[in-house]
């Protein structure tokens, strides 16, 4: 069936339409476009005989119609009166006549709307705004948009007009928005430019910022007010009632006591014609003097006097707090507070007490901090070290002594040799050493303050010889796979080779042995049993060379998991059971038997003399090892046959 | 794009032939009729006639009855202007034209143009 | 056959300027009144159709108007690309005729 598509039906003014004709008849004569929905001579748009190429327009054309081949009809620059139907009138080759009609509508291209508000200055809680989408134009859907979102679902929203006009009853200052109208017809959408809804209301009561009310004398008040409201506020300020001034900042410089009070902001809207005040109570406290720390010792001694530390000057109900090394006081028996906090004992001073101290007065408002003070404790001479810790020293070379001691004040120093003085000084030297110069070098330190003296003696060899070294281990039973060992090749030398072997071999390259300290220590990581072995290090220099007796490492491991002998399992009746358990472990373990699950004795052999089929069960022996505190098991099943059968066959 | 293409420029002396080609492309040939334009420089443009493309059907106007003669070769998309026993007054430039739409009272697609020079 | 007329064969003009080129007809031609350009190098153009349809693609500076006998084409600003010669046709009864042309020259 002859049929007309128009593309698209629903067209835009100045835009084009295609009649599509679907179906078209073949041996055509010719065809004919109408405008309207019948064929009349007088309203004929084109006409076409079929081969000439020639179309022929009729009274109907307007110079905007462009016919094709295939019948189709195109309408450029559509206007209104295009809207309506069209009739292809077609002739046939055997002249039988045949139609179809199509139809389009012709919309305007909608202008760009604007929004007219019956109210351009609401109150909030009390006007209605009427908000009206410009111009009012025929076949056109308007919409409404707020914030660019839909029109949300509220009691107080209300559409009319065919949806033209929005109402905003009894408006709040949430509804100052951004405003938008659409308009819509079936060719085009636009929207309006947005309009800001401006409700007028507040103010609401007023915030007082800062919050705080406490000051001390001396300080600047610096008060602001802030209410919310549209247009902003007015704002005054009254002080105990009296009006001060028109600002919305109240700054008094410099305040006593006597600038306490009632601070009341006043918040003044002219458009809504609305005050709201809030009160806030200021108190000024008189300024604490600075707090100072005074000590009942200046120099006291380590470990013999206490120090009494008290905060000055002492005021009637105040806070005292204190402060060391900028932490609050820690928890310790040696530390003591007065009943009101003001004096600080410490009791039997160390050298760590030197601080620093603060004391805090506390008021109202703020802590005020002392200076801090820092004590000075008499300590020491602890025991001197003397460096370096060579005991072995060549001919020929020169001998430099260093000796140091904690002290508090610096001690003074004194070098002795077998018994004799030498020198006061903290440094000894002598050069060109010979083997005269070995003996016993004493280095005295001494504290002038608190009396003490404390010695260190050092055998100082001189030898072209090496002596026999020995051996050291932090470590005598280490544990497998756990511990590490470190030895260290006694004594330390000057100019000193240092080497080892393991069973007389060197050593052999492994990531778990390690050589420091310039090859004076060997340290084995993780240690198995098989570095239980012997181990000797050795010294040279170029004179001479020595080597250390062996050390055996004595490693503790195990115990493994045990075996049970006779490996058979299956037994006759009246036979003996005599089993043995063993497993490898240092030191030996200790063994324990269960059968079927019952402790049995702590032997390493079971013996059951004359077994039944009742000895049958599992046999389980546990191992146990002291010293690595590991233990391990085995189970074992045994099965009795009765005699005269054969194990694995039955009667 | 449609275009028509036209041959190139003719040097005949009077009483030869001239046969002037005319390729369509960028829409179907068939579809649309082809006409002819004549251009002498001092006389202006004048219409020859047209051919039915799809016909073959020529039509002459009246001062081009005789010694023209329209053709087609609708495999090369292609029309010809033939002038038989030239005169010096078919000194001229011819153009080929289409209205490349059923509607053929203008023309939307003209080609370049060929001249043709007669001259003993 | 119908006769065309261009009255004026020639005319000079600033570039920027409006300009009106005016056609005839010895009769009534119902609109069917067609303009082109023709460009120095000999190119043809159709700028509008049925008396004020513009082509495609022709720039909204040229426009038509007219009726029954009488017709005119105006550029509504001259530009340098302008410069041609302007034919009108009629289309309303075979054989189509042409005007002698107009050409627009720059002053």
């Known amino acids: 069936k002859l049929t007309i598509e128009s593309t698209p039906f629903n067209v835009a003014e100045g835009k084009e339409v295609l009649l599509l004709v679907h179906n078209l008849p073949q041996h055509l004569f010719g065809y004919s476009w109408y405008k309207g929905e019948r064929v009349d001579g007088n309203r004929q748009i084109i006409g076409y005989v079929i081969g000439t190429q020639q179309a022929t327009p009729g009274p109907a054309y307007s110079g905007r119609e462009i016919i094709y081949p295939n019948a189709s009809l195109l309408i450029q620059n559509i206007i209104q009166n295009d809207t309506g139907f069209y009739t292809l009138h077609v002739i046939k080759s055997d002249l039988v006549n045949e139609e179809a009609t199509g139809q389009f509508r012709v919309y305007p291209e909608l202008p760009k709307p604007s929004i007219s508000s019956n109210n351009s200055k609401p109150v909030e809680d009390k006007d209605a705004v009427a908000f009206t989408c410009e111009p009012e134009t025929q076949d056109a859907t308007y919409l409404w948009w707020v914030n660019n979102q839909s029109l949300p679902v509220s009691p107080r929203l209300q559409l009319s007009n065919g949806n033209r006009t929005l109402t905003l009853f009894n408006v709040t200052r949430n509804d100052t928005a951004s405003y938008k109208c659409e308009t819509q017809n079936p060719v085009s959408a636009r929207r309006s430019d947005s309009v800001i809804l401006n409700v007028l209301y507040g103010p609401d009561a007023p915030t007082i910022s800062p919050l705080n009310t406490s000051y001390r004398s001396g300080e600047n008040l610096n008060l602001s007010c802030h209410a919310a409201s549209n247009p902003p506020a007015q704002y005054s300020w009254f002080v105990n009632g009296t009006f001060q001034q028109s600002t919305q900042e109240l700054f008094i410089p410099n305040i006593t006591v006597n600038n306490s009070g009632s601070y009341t902001c006043q918040a003044h809207n002219s458009d809504t014609g609305l005050n709201r005040t809030t009160v806030t109570t200021i108190t000024v406290y008189a300024e604490p003097p600075k707090p100072f720390i005074t000590s009942n010792n200046s120099n006291p001694v380590e470990d013999e006097d206490a120090v009494a530390l008290t905060c000055e000057p002492e005021i009637q109900n105040t806070t005292y707090l204190w402060w060391v090394n900028n932490q609050s006081l820690p928890v310790s028996p040696r530390l003591q507070l007065s009943n009101d906090n003001r004096t600080l004992t410490l009791l039997s001073v160390t050298r760590n007490d030197v601080g620093p101290y603060e004391c805090g007065i506390q008021n109202e408002l703020s802590v005020d901090h002392s200076d801090p003070v820092i004590l000075n404790v008499l300590y020491g001479p602890d025991d001197p070290t003397i460096s370096p810790s060579y005991t072995y020293y060549r001919p020929g070379v020169n001998l430099s002594l260093s000796c140091h001691a904690a002290s508090n004040p610096p001690a003074q120093y004194s070098w002795l040799i077998d018994g004799n003085i030498q020198q006061h000084t903290q440094e000894l030297f002598i050069s060109n050493i010979t083997e005269k110069n070995s003996g016993l070098y004493t280095c005295q330190a001494n504290n002038s303050a608190s009396g003490h003296s404390r010695t260190t003696v050092k055998t100082i060899t001189v030898s072209a010889e090496l002596p026999k070294p020995s051996i050291s281990s932090n470590n005598s039973k280490p544990v497998e796979d756990k511990d590490a060992v470190a030895f260290t090749c006694e004594p330390e030398a000057q100019n000193t080779t240092y080497l080892w072997w393991v069973n007389g071999q060197s050593l052999p390259v492994s990531p778990r042995l390690q050589l420091s300290n310039g090859n004076r220590t060997l340290t084995l990581f993780n240690v198995t049993r098989n570095d239980a072995r012997a181990y000797v290090c050795g010294i040279q220099n170029s004179v001479s060379a020595n080597r250390s007796d062996p050390v055996t490492l004595d490693v503790l491991y195990g115990p493994d998991t045990p075996i049970i002998s006779p490996p058979d399992s299956s037994y006759l009746s009246g036979a003996n059971l005599n089993l043995s358990c063993h497993s490898a472990s240092n030191p030996s373990p200790q063994y324990s038997w269960r059968i079927n699950g019952i402790p049995q004795q702590h032997t390493q052999v079971l013996f059951i003399a004359k077994i039944t089929p009742n000895n049958n069960g599992t046999y389980a022996c546990f191992v146990s090892n002291l010293a690595t505190g590991r233990n391990n098991s085995i189970v074992k099943s045994i099965t009795v046959s009765a005699s005269g059968t054969s194990p694995g066959l039955s009667a | 794009q449609i275009q028509l293409v036209q041959s190139g420029p003719e040097l005949k002396k009077p009483g030869e032939t001239v046969k002037i080609s005319c390729k369509a492309s960028?829409?179907?040939?068939?579809?649309?009729?082809l006409h002819w334009v004549k251009q002498v420089p001092v006389k202006g443009l004048k219409w020859m006639g047209w051919?039915?493309?799809?016909?073959?059907?020529?039509t002459y106007a009246d001062d081009f009855k005789g010694r023209f003669a329209f053709s087609l070769d609708t495999s090369a998309s292609s029309a010809y202007l033939q002038i038989h026993n030239l005169k010096n007054e078919d000194t001229a430039t011819y153009f080929c034209?289409?209205?490349?739409?059923?509607?053929?009272?203008?023309?939307?697609?003209w080609g370049a143009g060929t001249t043709v020079t007669v001259s003993a | 056959d119908i006769q065309m007329t261009q009255t004026t064969s020639s005319l000079s003009a600033s570039l920027g300027d409006r300009v009106t080129i005016s056609c005839r007809a010895s009769q009534d031609i119902s609109h069917f009144l067609n303009w082109y350009q023709q460009k120095p190098d000999g190119t043809v153009e159709l700028l509008i159709y049925?008396?004020?349809r513009l082509l495609s693609g022709v720039p909204s500076r040229f426009s038509g108007s007219g009726s029954g006998t009488d017709y005119s084409l105006t550029i509504a600003n001259l530009e340098q690309e302008d410069i041609a010669t302007y034919f009108c046709?009629?289309?309303?009864?075979?054989?189509?005729?042409f005007g002698g042309g107009t050409k627009v020259e720059i002053k």
């Open positions: 046709q009629q289309g309303k009864t075979l054989p189509w005729t």
């Open positions: 034209a289409s209205p490349v739409s059923l509607l053929f009272y203008y023309f939307t697609v």
């Open positions: 051919i039915n493309t799809e016909t073959g059907e020529p």
């Open positions: 049925y008396t004020s």
């Open positions: 960028g829409y179907t040939f068939t579809d649309y009729s």
